[in-house]
């Protein structure tokens, strides 16, 4: 006799306003009386719609939140398992039951906000800036909302960056522990002519982060010919174990570039008569604290002011 | 009594390969679900991977994904573990976990002795 | 993914003491939390399932309660077999299984 287990009931996908992140929900299956003692397992497979491949989970629970981009559609689909101890050895699954969440096609896709950029400066506070949409009217303005698990529900921003009395851009500080999680932004617009097509991003703070430069650059030589580079961390929030280096040196004509995760650097003289000696240095946070980041600007240059050459006196 | 024995552990160099085994006895291995944890020098307990009874369904830890592949020979009731692409960060002592219930994983009711694997230059 | 965090990290306790670890989930894991003891160069062995289900052969004086984000081993009375290393594990959800990062149980 082949042992069947039926899906779950009432499987959908649900928006709590939280800017893309979703709740996938559902009820448990009819189980028969032979399995009522059996624990159900639950697989759920998901994904944005233009996606090759689907995210696998599996749960006891009958809830499952992610995020996702709202630029686009969503699919999902669950099926119940019977673990094998109860089935005799044999693995038992239920057919798939699918879902989807629609996105509002309210508003052409012209009007939604063009080259949304977000840099998290100095780990301190974030900036994002955007440009009106390709066909908009003279009265459009846009509004950006953002959230992130910590907060009870989405916010708005309030503090805009303003062309013309329009909003082009938000600046967001006092984010409490809002790095290492996703951090969802939607920007939307209203105009009275037209409606206004919503614009979702998704990332997580700590892999936009552009520091400040490095600063206190200091150079000397030992021997004639040992350089010894170094430079302090900038202030702020970063921790020091953060940072990579990359560094310009210069010998009169000829420069050439090197990297660290140190805060010095020793080097020889390429020639022990260069008059000129010369470097600059930027950072970024490193691999170990964040998956990306933006390098610093430039520091200042710092030249080695000292003795130049054997028959300098 | 039910024993899981690993084996295949050794020193690899960075990029190499190795292929552990567990061989298991003492139930119905084709029954219950199994899984690999890991446990680098003095640090906590780090689950890498599981597989469903009849091998149909492999589970995988971000940080392994891609380069280790679990299966399982329930006619020679054995779990294995090939590792590619290994890096220094995979040294640990690997143990196999038999799952307690549960179709993909669950608590485990019992572990081998492990197998030691070493990457270094 | 649901994170487990333990404390304390380091319990020091004499034999006879009641001794409580906490382990919370980052999201509600309903009761599928285990409890593992481990000893130096040893593989973990399985003290409570379920939350709440004692393992068989595991010594009365162990137990576990709580539900949903958080859950206690007990420990009525230390013996000096007790001396180890103890991890809750979730499996309510997964990929990936995740351990809490462990309480070191040593004599005071």
């Known amino acids: 006799l082949e042992i069947k287990v039926n899906p779950p009931q009432d499987f959908e996908i649900l928006d709590p306003g939280l800017l893309g992140y979703l709740y996938l929900q559902w009820k448990p299956p009819v189980v028969i009386e032979k399995f009522k003692g059996c624990t159900l397992e639950y697989e759920l497979k998901y994904r944005n719609v233009d996606s090759d491949s689907w995210k696998t989970i599996i749960t006891r629970n009958l809830i499952y939140k992610d995020g996702f981009d709202l630029n686009k559609g969503i699919e999902g689909k669950i099926r119940t398992h019977l673990s094998e101890h109860c089935t005799n050895g044999s693995e038992v699954q239920s057919p798939w039951i699918e879902a989807s969440y629609g996105i509002s096609d309210e508003g052409s896709l012209e009007t939604k906000i063009q080259d949304m950029k977000c840099i998290y400066y100095n780990w301190q506070y974030l900036v994002c800036s955007w440009k009106p949409g390709k066909t908009v009217y003279s009265d459009t303005n846009y509004t950006m909302f953002f959230w992130y698990e910590g907060l009870d529900h989405a916010l708005q921003c309030a503090d805009y960056l303003q062309h013309d009395e329009k909003n082009v851009g938000c600046k967001l500080s006092n984010l409490d522990s809002s790095d290492y999680k996703d951090f969802f932004i939607c920007v939307n617009g209203s105009s009275k002519l037209e409606p206004i097509r919503s614009s979702y991003t998704v990332f997580q703070l700590q892999n936009i982060v552009k520091p400040l430069p490095p600063e206190f650059l200091h150079i000397s030589v030992e021997n004639s010919i040992d350089i010894r580079m170094k430079w302090s961390t900038p202030g702020g929030p970063i921790p020091p174990r953060c940072y990579t280096y990359e560094i310009v040196i210069r010998e009169d004509d000829i420069s050439w570039e090197s990297a660290t995760d140190k805060n010095d650097m020793k080097l020889k003289r390429r020639a022990n008569e260069s008059e000129d000696l010369c470097f600059f240095v930027r950072c970024k946070v490193n691999i170990y604290c964040a998956d990306d980041g933006i390098w610093s600007e430039w520091s200042e240059e710092e030249c080695w002011e000292g003795y130049t050459g054997p028959d300098s006196k | 009594e039910v024993q899981l024995l690993e084996s295949g552990g050794g020193l690899v160099q960075p990029g190499g390969s190795l292929r552990l085994s567990c061989a298991a006895s003492g139930f119905t291995f084709s029954s219950y679900a199994m899984s690999w944890v890991r446990q680098a020098p003095g640090k906590g307990l780090e689950w890498v991977s599981a597989i469903s009874g009849s091998g149909g369904s492999t589970y995988y830890a971000d940080s392994v994904k891609g380069r280790f592949t679990i299966s399982r020979d329930n006619s020679k009731n054995t779990l294995y573990l090939q590792m590619n692409s290994l890096r220094a960060e995979d040294t640990a002592v690997y143990y196999c976990a038999k799952v307690r219930y549960g179709w993909g994983a669950g608590a485990f009711d019992y572990w081998g002795q492990g197998t030691l694997v070493t990457v270094s230059s | 993914d649901i994170q487990m965090t333990q404390s304390p990290s380091t319990l020091s306790a004499s034999v006879g003491d009641r001794v409580t670890i906490t382990c919370r989930a980052s999201q509600s894991i309903s009761s599928w939390l285990a409890w593992y003891q481990q000893k130096p160069g040893k593989a973990p062995k399985l003290l409570i399932y379920d939350a709440s289900s004692l393992e068989s052969g595991v010594p009365s004086r162990f137990s576990g309660s709580g539900s949903g984000t958080e859950f206690t081993l007990t420990i009525s009375s230390l013996q000096p077999d007790d001396f180890a290393t103890y991890y809750c594990?979730?499996?309510?959800?997964?990929?990936?299984?995740?351990f809490g990062q462990g309480t070191k149980v040593e004599i005071k």
């Open positions: 594990q979730q499996y309510d959800t997964y990929p990936p299984i995740t």
